[in-house]
């Protein structure tokens, strides 16, 4: 049964919202999709979760959520916010998740984000952000996940990322980024997942991924790369790599020499004609290899050290004979 305290909690539920105890004597409040144009005023001080997404909120006043010191998750996605003032999140000392996606923000709300020391997850995707100020994330020392996809960025906000040494996953997909400079992510030593798909990336600095010592997933699909991304060679923990749907014509010798942990490589929908014979050596975790239409391949690839392939597809090549060792190399 419910305790007397939970009854008191539920009496602090705003009109039309759905509220329930969260099991820790705190309150989960769902005010989503109610056509609200402003924040509800009579929120319980014991609120831990507040969902205000899919409303018509167009502005936040400074300090609109006073005393919500237990609030851990705030959802403001799918509103009409164009600007978030300084002090909008003042006093939210426990805030771990902030969702601001699907609004009309043009800049990262730098001043509003200051001092959110507990924040672990920040969603800014699907806005109109074209500029990320250098110091905008400087106080977010606990941030683990950052969504900046589906915005209007034309370059990597290199300086802004320098303070995010705890970041584990980030997406910059669906922007208009055209180049990744050297050391673009140089301080993100904890980053495990990086999504850069659906941009306009045509060039990579040769050291652009240096510093990403924990990276396991890199998605460069749907870009304008016309050369193999040799900068991946410092990614010694990389497990999943995507660069399909680019304009890459060749995969060089020793292409994945620094990536012995690779399990999956997606590179279909590239006009690949040449593949270095040693390109796929020493990939003991690789399970699937598909090479379609590589017309300049005349020799069967040397798969020394790539002993766990379960599927190998080679079409459109000009291989006239198979090496005698091919059956020894494959399981």
């Amino acid at each position: 049964g419910s305790s007397p305290r939970s009854g008191v909690l539920l009496r602090g539920c705003p009109t039309h919202c759905h509220c329930e105890p969260d099991g820790r004597m705190l309150l989960r409040v769902d005010c989503s999709d109610l056509g609200l144009s402003e924040l509800p005023s009579n929120l319980s001080v014991f609120t831990s979760y507040l969902d205000l997404s899919m409303n018509n909120i167009s502005q936040l006043l400074p300090n609109p959520l006073p005393s919500l010191r237990f609030l851990e998750e705030l959802r403001l996605a799918g509103n009409a916010l164009t600007y978030i003032p300084k002090g909008a999140f003042t006093g939210l000392y426990s805030l771990k998740v902030l969702m601001l996606q699907n609004n009309q923000l043009r800049h990262v709300p730098t001043e509003a984000l200051q001092n959110l020391r507990s924040l672990q997850s920040l969603r800014l995707d699907a806005n109109h952000i074209s500029y990320v100020p250098p110091s905008c994330f400087s106080g977010l020392h606990s941030l683990r996940h950052l969504w900046l996809d589906d915005n209007a960025l034309t370059e990597i906000p290199v300086q802004a990322f320098r303070s995010l040494s705890a970041l584990q996953a980030m997406t910059l997909a669906l922007n208009k980024i055209h180049h990744i400079p050297d050391y673009a992510f140089g301080n993100l030593s904890s980053l495990v997942v990086l999504h850069l798909h659906n941009n306009r990336i045509h060039s990579l600095g040769k050291k652009c991924f240096d510093g990403l010592h924990s990276l396991e997933t890199l998605d460069l699909n749907y870009n304008n790369l016309d050369e193999f991304p040799t900068a991946i060679r410092t990614l010694s923990n990389l497990k999943e790599l995507g660069f399909h749907s680019n304009n890459i014509r060749s995969i060089p010798e020793k292409a994945f020499v620094g990536n012995p942990s690779l399990i999956t490589i997606h590179f279909y929908d590239n006009p690949i004609q040449f593949v270095g014979r040693s390109a796929f050596q020493h990939l003991p975790e690789l399970r699937t290899l598909t090479l379609n239409g590589a017309s300049q391949i005349t020799e069967f690839p040397d798969l020394t050290g790539t002993a766990n392939l379960e599927s190998l597809t080679l079409t459109g090549a000009q291989i006239s004979s198979l090496p005698q060792t091919v059956c020894n190399q494959l399981p």
Partner: antibody
């Protein structure tokens, strides 16, 4: 603990070649660039070139390009600097260093003195 | 090539006093908001030791009396309170573009 241990001192005649080694330990060898820097007696520091171990990725100072080769051996975690057509002005201490945060040189070998004398 | 010029060539400072070394690059070493300028300390018979990276970031384990500042072409290394063990030659270095280049060095001594 990250360590870079270089080979011992060499004395060479003008026109000869020298090969200096740098053995790395304490980190993932293929994930960091190794730089070579030299220091003539009583002089400053001069960058020679760099390699990403295990790959064919190298860059050289144009001044040394025709005389220098930097290679690596991942099986022993060792990088090599070979300098040919030695002349007296190549007398220097040769250092290897790891390219760390943003390319700064965060760990250095102890240095190898190469003396070129007839 | 980018030329790095340090000043002064040598510096004598009393123990506990401030030491300031300047480094000027012949062109900007800034890229995407980062200044690709680093500072090293070298004591006799030893390899250089990294003190500061990206103009102002203190390398792990380096005492906080060392600090760096500047951007573009002009940079400064400051030792706020000189200690006996700080006697050394200090070098700035840029890795904005190949070839990476060093300043000529500044010798710091005790007055």
């Amino acid at each position: 603990e990250v360590q870079l241990v270089q080979s011992g001192a060499e004395v060479k005649k003008p026109g000869a070649s020298v090969k200096v080694s740098c053995k790395a330990s304490g980190y993932t060898f293929s994930a960091y660039w190794i730089e070579w820097v030299r220091q003539a007696p009583g002089q400053g520091l001069e960058w020679i070139g760099e390699i990403l171990p295990g790959s064919d990725s190298t860059d050289y100072n144009e001044k040394f390009k025709v005389r220098v080769t930097i290679t690596s051996d991942t099986s022993t975690s060792t990088v090599y600097l070979e300098l040919s057509s030695l002349r007296s002005e190549d007398t220097a201490v040769y250092y290897c260093a790891r390219g760390g945060h943003y390319g700064s040189l965060d760990y250095w070998g102890q240095g190898t003195l190469v003396t070129v004398s007839s | 090539d980018i030329v790095m010029t340090q000043s002064p060539d040598s510096l004598a400072v009393s123990l506990g006093e401030r030491a300031t070394i300047n480094c000027r690059a012949s062109e900007s070493v800034d890229n995407y908001g980062n200044s690709f300028m680093h500072w090293y300390q070298q004591k006799p018979g030893q390899p250089p030791k990294l003190l500061i990276y990206l103009a102002s970031n203190l390398e792990s384990g380096v005492p906080d009396r060392f600090s760096g500042s500047g951007s573009g072409t002009d940079f400064t290394l400051t030792i706020s309170s000189l200690q006996a063990e700080d006697v050394a030659v200090y070098y700035c270095q840029q890795n904005y573009e190949d070839p990476f280049t060093f300043g000529q060095g500044t010798k710091v001594e005790i007055k």
